[in-house]
């Protein structure tokens, strides 16, 4: 499966939208930094087949969609930017789902690496727990926004490696 060029552009647009979403100066939030334990090894793309890598990317985007679809999120971020953000995420999910369908029967390995999916879910659970503990404060959301931007940048690297594997 070839991930379309539009997918890469959508990823870039997602990062640009997130960069615009800031509401307060992040300089006031330094003390709220937190180690969410980003599962770097799941995005190295060396240890599993292409279909499994796609499923991990899909899970990360789905979890991001869920995180930013809450009422607490809607109360924090600009509605217009959020709508654009959802559109881009939806586009990426569709691309990855189409890709996963094409990979059915292409590889002998399972389409999903359950352990990797669970690792990504636990990562997002830690993010949600942090937000809850911080009572969804503006600074907590700034820290989460920075974390998600970083994770999207790292996942973009995995997507590029997948494209070079074609």
């Amino acid at each position: 499966c070839d991930l379309p060029q539009t997918h890469s552009l959508s990823n870039r647009r997602t990062l640009m939208i997130m960069a615009q979403m800031g509401r307060i100066s992040p300089f006031s939030c330094l003390k709220d930094r937190h180690d969410f334990g980003f599962p770097q090894e799941e995005f190295d793309g060396n240890q599993f087949q292409k279909a499994q890598a796609i499923s991990v990317l899909h899970e990360m985007i789905q979890q991001t969609f869920n995180l930013f679809s809450t009422k607490d999120s809607s109360a924090t971020w600009d509605e217009t930017l959020l709508d654009k953000f959802y559109t881009e995420l939806y586009q990426q999910l569709n691309d990855l789902e189409a890709c996963m369908m094409q990979e059915v029967g292409v590889e002998d390995t399972p389409l999903m690496n359950v352990d990797s999916i669970l690792t990504v879910r636990k990562y997002f659970q830690r993010i949600t727990l942090y937000l809850t503990e911080k009572k969804y404060s503006p600074c907590a959301w700034e820290v989460v926004r920075a974390e998600i931007m970083r994770s999207f940048s790292l996942s973009a690297n995995l997507q590029e490696r997948l494209r070079r594997k074609e």
Partner: antibody, heavy 121, light 107 residues
Framework: EVQLVQSGAEVKKPGESLKISCKGS????????IGWVRQMPGKGLEWMGI????????AYSPSFQGQVTISADKSISTAYLQWSSLKASDTAMYYC??????????????WGQGTLVTVSS | DIQMTQSPSSLSASVGDRVTITCRAS??????LNWYQQKPGKAPKLLIY???SLQSGVPSRFSGSGSGTDFTLTISSLQPEDFATYYC?????????FGQGTKVEIK
């Protein structure tokens, strides 16, 4: 390879203006903040201020607020430190260093080589 | 501003010695403390971040500990290349502040 390359040494007279630069390469320039640190001859490190190149938001140490201006041009991955009127006491080595912002990652993990500024009449 | 106080300001040690440098913050900074090494004419180099995390490429003889207000940098077995000045820096809040430095000299 991540690099921060600073502009060359400067010799200036009191009252003159100056702008020194720090060019980042080998990483996404807008994903990291750039901090500036002063080291006067034979002395320790003093944090001056920081900039987020993605939107040019800045924060200064109270000691340097109003004394210097930090700016950035993300189109050329470069941060700047400038003075409108230099004093002899500005004589020092100035370093830039990258900072991960609100991410849980090493602070000031890469540094420029330093720019020596000498102010003398 | 958060004040950072290092001790000692200088020390003399021999190759193979265990060296300990302490840093105290004027208020709690959780674990938001970094340690840097600087050699004459060179830019500082990050050794330890968030109190105890070893920066990539830094020898394992360097270690950091502490939280709250009291922190320690330990060099388990001093090597010739370790003679330098060491700085702590609080990463908890702006303005960021450094300790005054500890110079490690050859005995």
């Amino acid at each position: 390879e991540v690099q921060l390359v600073q502009s060359g040494a400067e010799v200036k007279k009191p009252g003159e203006s100056l702008k020194i630069s720090c060019k980042g390469s080998g990483y996404s320039f807008t994903s990291y903040w750039i901090g500036w640190v002063r080291q006067m001859p034979g002395k320790g490190l003093e944090w001056m201020g920081i900039i987020d190149p993605s939107d040019s938001d800045t924060a200064y140490s109270p000691s340097f607020q109003g004394q210097v201006t930090i700016s950035a041009d993300k189109s050329i991955s470069t941060a700047y430190l400038q003075w409108s009127s230099l004093k002899a006491s500005d004589t020092a080595m100035y370093y830039c260093a990258r900072h991960p912002g609100l991410n849980w990652a090493p602070d000031f993990d890469y540094w420029g080589q330093g720019t020596l500024v000498t102010v003398s009449s | 501003d958060i004040q950072m106080t290092q001790s000692p300001s200088s020390l003399s040690a021999s190759v193979g010695d265990r060296v300990t440098i302490t840093c105290r913050a004027s208020q709690s900074i959780d674990g938001a403390l970094n340690w840097y090494q600087q050699k004459p004419g060179k830019a500082p180099k990050l050794l330890i971040y968030f109190a105890s995390s070893l920066q990539s490429g830094v020898p394992s003889r360097f270690s950091g500990s502490g939280s709250g207000t009291d922190f320690t940098l330990t060099i388990s077995s001093l090597q010739p290349e370790d003679f330098a000045t060491y700085y702590c820096q609080q990463a908890y809040d702006f303005p960021l502040t450094f300790g005054q430095g500890t110079k490690v000299e050859i005995k």
